[in-house]
Interface confidence: low
Amino acid sequence: QLLEPCGYIYPEFPVVQRGSNFTAICVLKEACLQHYYVNASYIVWKTNHAAVPREQVTVINRTTSSVTFTDVVLPSVQLTCNILSFGQIEQNVYGVTMLSGFPPDKPTNLTCIVNEGKNMLCQWDPGRETYLETNYTLKSEWATEKFPDCQSKHGTSCMVSYMPTYYVNIEVWVEAENALGKVSSESINFDPVDKVKPTPPYNLSVTNSEELSSILKLSWVSSGLGGLLDLKSDIQYRTKDASTWIQVPLEDTMSPRTSFTVQDLKPFTEYVFRIRSIKDSGKGYWSDWSEEASGTTYEDRPSRPPSFWYKTNPSHGQEYRSVRLIWKALPLSEANGKILDYEVILTQSKSVSQTYTVTGTELTVNLTNDRYVASLAARNKVGKSAAAVLTIPSPHVTAAYSVVNLKAFPKDNLLWVEWTPPPKPVSKYILEWCVLSENAPCVEDWQQEDATVNRTHLRGRLLESKCYQITVTPVFATGPGGSESLKAYLKQAAPARGPTVRTKKVGKNEAVLAWDQIPVDDQNGFIRNYSISYRTSVGKEMVVHVDSSHTEYTLSSLSSDTLYMVRMAAYTDEGGKDGPEFTFTTPKFAQGEIE
């Protein structure tokens, strides 16, 4: 059978507002007082098994004791009333759990959404944490009819159990209630049709146009509550490799539609599209994006001619010369399609032009020593580019006018070249470069720059610590001008090896040292200077610095009949490297001198 408790705590289920004061009382039963020979002064209050200080306790009468707590902050406290029976034995009389928290804040920011094909979901901001069990109930009604309440599981949202009825306004509000209070949000009044989030458009397809290489036509299917809603669209697109989307102006897609032509696109380019929709009034929510669809614009004729240059090979006879015409493949953005071939037309004054169709990017022809004009056009299936024209003068004509103040310097991992234009109008500039090496021929790469350019960077794959010979040639309507060259490094390093020093002549008190320049393959940069270190086996080391233009140096004030150790180092802007150590001995006597 159940044992009767010795007394009770009131209130039995205490809930206190944080920061406020709270008083509980413990009332002992008369039978208990007599059984244990106690009264209320024997009561010991405890919170979480710790005795409450006596100053918080008041004995009201022989059966009743109260305890007062100020500024309650703990979320949950076990409060027990205990008696000291027979002097020292502590008996538990009763226990309660005291909870603390806050009354609910008035819910704010109540918003609702109708995901197409689902019931309405409403969401709100509950305000500050209550720290208590708090029930949130979403209420909704028409002017004439109440809908079933929606009990929130999370306290911040609820999905109603009924299907929405469109084109009739509904009133919605949230009630929040816990042990400390009850509060209602402001109500919102709306037509559920203005809260719809449509399902994404589907079956998005993209087609191109043979007539216009700058457009793609889109078509799609919209749902809009099965045609109940008129939807406007939001269309975004990007090139296949891009990461950012381009926005079609929303004002262009405001009217309900299931197709659209996107303009101002680049020819022969793959684009990816996506589309979303919203009620045409702009009320409600945007749908999620559709699945992406891609399409490629039609080809257009190449937008510019290729870069065009020529090289003259050494001729064996006097009457003919071998000329190699060279050009660069157009980048995709300028080719505007698949380049099928190139058309080269060679014209010699007062003679019929010769036309060549070439699939590669060079053509070698044998020309007489007359002046020629070569033109080059790239062709795709739509048409030909404009022609690049190059005058090949007679070899007897001396090239005049070259660029001045030619400079090269590395910056941001690129090798930059700049110059001052010649005093005569230029058609274009040709930059040529190659790696200088004693072990391999100088294999040239080249690029073309417009007449307005006087600073550019080399666009090939350049290597660090390699010496590049760079040549700039202005090209005029009459043919190439004079060429200017310089050497440059993308990035210097310390030399791969130092100079090997030797003696050219040794006297009693001096020695002439000589060395060879470090091969260009080992220089790794511009050699700025040398250092010569020399010492005897017992003396201290001496160092002299020598300009990089020298290949010999005289050491003076040496001791006679002495072994010297010599080492040389070469320095670039990025550091130095020692060569091997060399030894020599000065003679005891000068030439013709007797002991």
Epitope: T108, N109, T111, I113, L121, Q123, W124, D125, G127, R128, H154, G155, T156, S157, K197, Y285, W286
Partner: nanobody, 125 residues
Framework: QVQLQESGGGLVQPGGSLRLSCAAS????????MSWVRQAPGKGLEWVSA????????YYADSVKGRFTISRDNAKNTLYLQLNSLKTEDTAMYCC??????????????????WGPGTQVTVSS
């Protein structure tokens, strides 16, 4: 009880960077989506960025897209916000906010509160 403690704010010049942290306790951090919000002087709360419980999906306000990066370390119960290319209009008190589910629905915008003390970010030359 839920506790959120922001840190990492400070004074920085335009174009500079900061990394804000939010240490969370009192709940199962890895189960909830989290957001960063901010309040500029004299203005209302503005939502900045959100991340789902697993960290696989992130969301940004247009005003910070491409400059701010949200991330989380569920093992350390910590939320982060990396602020790059800061502008004077980014000056605000930044707070982190806990959502009530693991997923964040960007089509639903509702009120946020700063439960923690926040951390002040001042962008000035």
């Amino acid at each position: 009880q839920v506790q959120l403690q922001e840190s990492g704010g400070g004074l920085v010049q335009p174009g500079g960077s900061l990394r804000l942290s939010c240490a969370a306790s009192g709940f199962t951090f890895s189960s909830y989506a989290m957001s960063w919000v901010r309040q500029a002087p004299g203005k209302g709360l503005e939502w900045v960025s959100a991340i789902n419980s697993g960290g696989g999906s992130t969301y940004y306000a247009d005003s910070v897209k491409g400059r701010f990066t949200i991330s989380r370390d569920n093992a350390k119960n910590t939320l982060y916000l990396q602020l790059n290319s800061l502008k004077t209009e980014d000056t605000a008190m930044y707070c982190c906010a806990k959502h009530v589910t693991g997923d964040y629905d960007p089509s639903l915008r509702y009120g946020y509160n700063c439960w923690g003390p926040g951390t002040q970010v001042t962008v000035s030359s």
